[in-house]
Interface confidence: low
């Protein structure tokens, strides 16, 4: 059943409906383990609802690909912003050092 159990699988049923990438807040995949012998995919929607997805479904496999692509793009964007910030800091530092020299 649809409930988290300590030391057990989380999902008894899987969601039948289509879940769109836009409505996803998070997507977690759990590999088989001693406490649960099957792959579990748990989606957290933007409205806070958590639901179990069918790992064998073609739609779900496609959703996972899109989600992973989106996550990696966001990481790249974050890294890009960090890189830009570092450049700005370097520029500011060099400007300060020039100012010090001129005074």
């Amino acid at each position: 059943t649809p409930v988290v159990r300590k030391g057990r699988c989380s999902c008894i049923s899987t969601n039948q409906g289509t879940i769109h990438l836009q409505s996803l807040k998070d997507l977690k995949q759990f590999a088989p383990s001693p406490s649960c012998e099957k792959i579990e995919i748990i989606a957290t929607l933007k409205n806070g609802v958590q639901t179990c997805l069918n790992p064998d479904s073609a739609d779900v496999k496609e959703l996972i690909k899109k989600w992973e692509k989106q996550v990696s793009q966001k990481k790249k964007q974050k890294n890009g912003k960090k890189h830009q910030k570092k450049k700005v800091l370097k520029v500011r530092k060099s400007q300060r050092s020039r100012q010090k020299k001129t005074t």
Partner: antibody, heavy 124, light 109 residues
Framework: QVQLVESGGGVVQPGRSLRLSCAAS????????MHWVRQAPGKGLEWVAV????????GYADSVKGRFTISRDNSKNTLYLQMNSLRAEDTAVYYC?????????????????WGQGTTVTVSS | EIVLTQSPGTLSLSPGERATLSCRAS???????LAWYQQKPGQAPRLLIY???SRATGIPDRFSGSGSGTDFTLTISRLEPEDFAVYYC??????????FGPGTKVDIK
């Protein structure tokens, strides 16, 4: 339409075995957890067993643990209940029921589809 | 193991009256895990309420559920002739274990 049809009930002697079947139609059987629930004559409902959508998890009531086995064949859209070492107190109408749609992992959606039941009588 | 107690055992009312059915748990139950069913003679049970207060598909709004912790209530605001039946509460617990209450019979006065 969504339907569950039980079969396999009958009169059986104490200590003998019986296998119940539940044929599902009108929905994607492999996406749903399934239950067996029974009702002794003139009594209330008693939950018997549950099986996850893929058969990985099974749960049993203490009264049947070690004697009954729940299983499913998703290729045949069929749920089973193997009943061994039957006792007089196992006499009941046995219903199969579908786990409620939704499968939110922090929520129990009840049993939303039920069969009409099959009668098991254990008597010498 | 959680034990559910339902009261009263029998409720005798007339059509149009309000019915209040109680379900008490021996220990605290998450409201997310409580359901109510209706059963008429010779028929399979029918899901009415899940998550303590959410109506199942096709259930009229005269049926409502409430409660939390150990005390839950099913209310039928105005009894219709077809509402005279036995009502069961049910809880889901880990392991997984599902427990039904003993039922409340609502009959015609």
């Amino acid at each position: 339409q969504v339907q569950l049809v039980e079969s396999g009930g009958g009169v059986v002697q104490p200590g003998r075995s019986l296998r119940l079947s539940c044929a599902a139609s009108g929905f994607t059987f492999s996406d749903y957890g399934m239950h067996w629930v029974r009702q002794a004559p003139g009594k209330g409902l008693e939950w018997v067993a549950v099986i996850s959508h893929n058969g990985a998890i099974k749960g049993y009531a203490d009264s049947v643990k070690g004697r009954f086995t729940i299983s499913r064949d998703n290729s045949k859209n069929t749920l089973y209940l193997q009943m061994n070492s039957l006792r007089a107190e196992d006499t009941a109408v046995y219903y199969c029921a579908r786990e409620g749609d939704g499968s939110n992992i922090y929520y129990y959606y009840g049993m939303d589809v039920w069969g009409q039941g099959t009668t098991v009588t254990v008597s010498s | 193991e959680i034990v559910l107690t339902q009261s009263p055992g029998t409720l005798s009312l007339s059509p149009g009256e309000r019915a209040t059915l109680s379900c008490r748990a021996s220990q605290s139950v998450s409201s997310s895990y409580l359901a109510w069913y209706q059963q008429k003679p010779g028929q399979a049970p029918r899901l009415l309420i899940y998550g303590a207060s959410s109506r199942a598909t096709g259930i009229p709004d005269r049926f409502s559920g409430s409660g939390s912790g150990t005390d839950f209530t099913l209310t039928i605001s105005r009894l219709e002739p077809e509402d005279f039946a036995v009502y069961y509460c049910q809880q889901y617990g880990s392991s997984p274990i599902f427990t039904f209450g003993p039922g409340t019979k609502v009959d015609i006065k």
